[in-house]
């Protein structure tokens, strides 16, 4: 049975041009995490490998930088940025963990990071 | 297997500077963060910094910006960590350490440095 | 920063006992809590990640629990080889922080 939780930034918002980390935590389970997926819709941006360490897809390899953590600073934001994002937790036994967070970047300078998470 | 090599110690002058090394070897160099962590006599831990050597990004502690640089040469898996203005305050053991999925998984056997006249 | 506080400082127990050592964090780090041993004159060894993940190696004596602002390393009948520091970090956010530490010493 999976009993783990994802918790995530939730929803979020940031100014263009600047930057922000997303983030997931897995509690609750004491299954093994062997991977985690970062993905933006269906295009995958980075995963974090427990043998391989991490890969940043390489159209977001100037932009993207893993961490902190298990998380993803997304550098450089423009209005396409907009949009839906996943982390996705692999575990032995328990299988695929998928937590969601949505990022609207702002043309305004108004924009307040609207989550539970405090952004650095 | 995933080894981190580091000098045994170095023994500089106050005022000077120094380069400490850590070469990585058993695994892919630029996948994974490097840290520095100091500890003195034997003390607590302070974490310093890290890079990724994938893309040279940094993080610095507030109280070490001024005072270290890190830097990578890829060609021979070695990050580099640059003290400058050196005092007593900087005697310590550094050590470098690589960040996986899991943490802080593997540590380099630290490099004493000594501070002294 | 996040500030990690330890406690207590120091314990003394004896072999076979079974201890709990406690990691305060401030503000709410959720899971990203690191537990590690620390003998003299060696490096740190991971012992727990993210507040509960084991480690391979570490034995099954060893364990972590806690979300949020509070966990806690426990340590099942404890044996001789188990005294020395530990000590908590976080990967939150940046600048990683470790906690004071926890001296185990040998009553």
């Known amino acids: 049975m999976m009993t783990g939780t994802i918790e995530t930034t939730g929803n979020i918002s940031a100014e263009k041009g600047g930057s922000i980390i997303l983030q997931c935590h897995l509690s609750s389970t004491t299954a093994q995490v062997t991977q985690v997926n970062w993905e933006q819709q269906d295009q995958l941006l980075a995963i974090c490998n427990a043998d391989l360490g991490w890969h940043i897809s390489p159209s977001f390899k100037d932009r993207v930088a893993p961490g902190p953590g298990l998380g993803l600073t997304l550098q450089s934001l423009t209005v396409n940025d907009t949009g839906e994002y996943f982390c996705i937790y692999h575990t032995y036994p328990d299988g695929t963990y998928t937590g969601r967070i949505f990022l609207e970047v702002l043309e305004s300078s108004v924009a307040e990071h609207g989550a539970r998470f405090q952004i650095p | 297997q995933v080894q981190l090599q580091q000098p045994g110690s170095e023994l500089v002058r106050p005022g000077a500077s120094v380069k400490l090394s850590c070469k990585a070897s058993?695994?892919?160099?630029?996948?994974?963060?490097m840290h520095w962590v100091k500890q003195r006599h034997g003390q607590g831990l302070e974490w310093i910094g890290n890079?990724?050597?994938?893309?040279?990004?940094?993080n610095y502690d507030e109280k070490f910006k001024s005072k270290v640089t890190l830097t990578v040469d890829t060609s021979s898996s070695t990050v580099y960590m640059h003290l400058s203005s050196l005092t007593s305050e900087d005697s310590a053991v550094y050590y470098c350490?690589?960040?996986?999925?899991?943490?802080?998984?593997?540590w380099g056997q630290g490099t004493t440095l000594t501070v002294s006249s | 920063d996040i500030v990690l506080t330890q406690s207590p400082a120091t314990l003394s127990v004896t072999p076979g006992d079974s201890v709990s050592l406690s990691c305060r964090a401030s503000?709410?780090?959720?899971?990203?809590l690191h537990w590690f041993q620390q003998k003299s004159h060696e490096s740190p060894r991971l012992l727990i990640s993210?507040?509960?993940q084991s480690i391979s190696g570490i034995p099954s004596r060893f364990s972590g629990s806690g979300s949020g602002t509070d966990f806690t390393l426990s340590i099942n009948s404890l044996e001789t080889e188990d005294f020395g520091m530990y000590f908590c970090?976080?990967?939150?956010?940046?600048?990683?922080?470790f906690g004071g530490g926890t001296k185990l010493e040998i009553k």
């Open positions: 890079i990724f050597p994938g893309s040279d990004t940094t």
């Open positions: 350490t690589r960040e996986g999925l899991y943490a802080f998984d593997y």
């Open positions: 058993g695994y892919t160099f630029t996948s994974y963060w």
């Open positions: 970090q976080q990967s939150n956010s940046w600048p990683y922080t």
């Open positions: 993210y507040a509960s």
């Open positions: 503000p709410n780090i959720r899971n990203s």
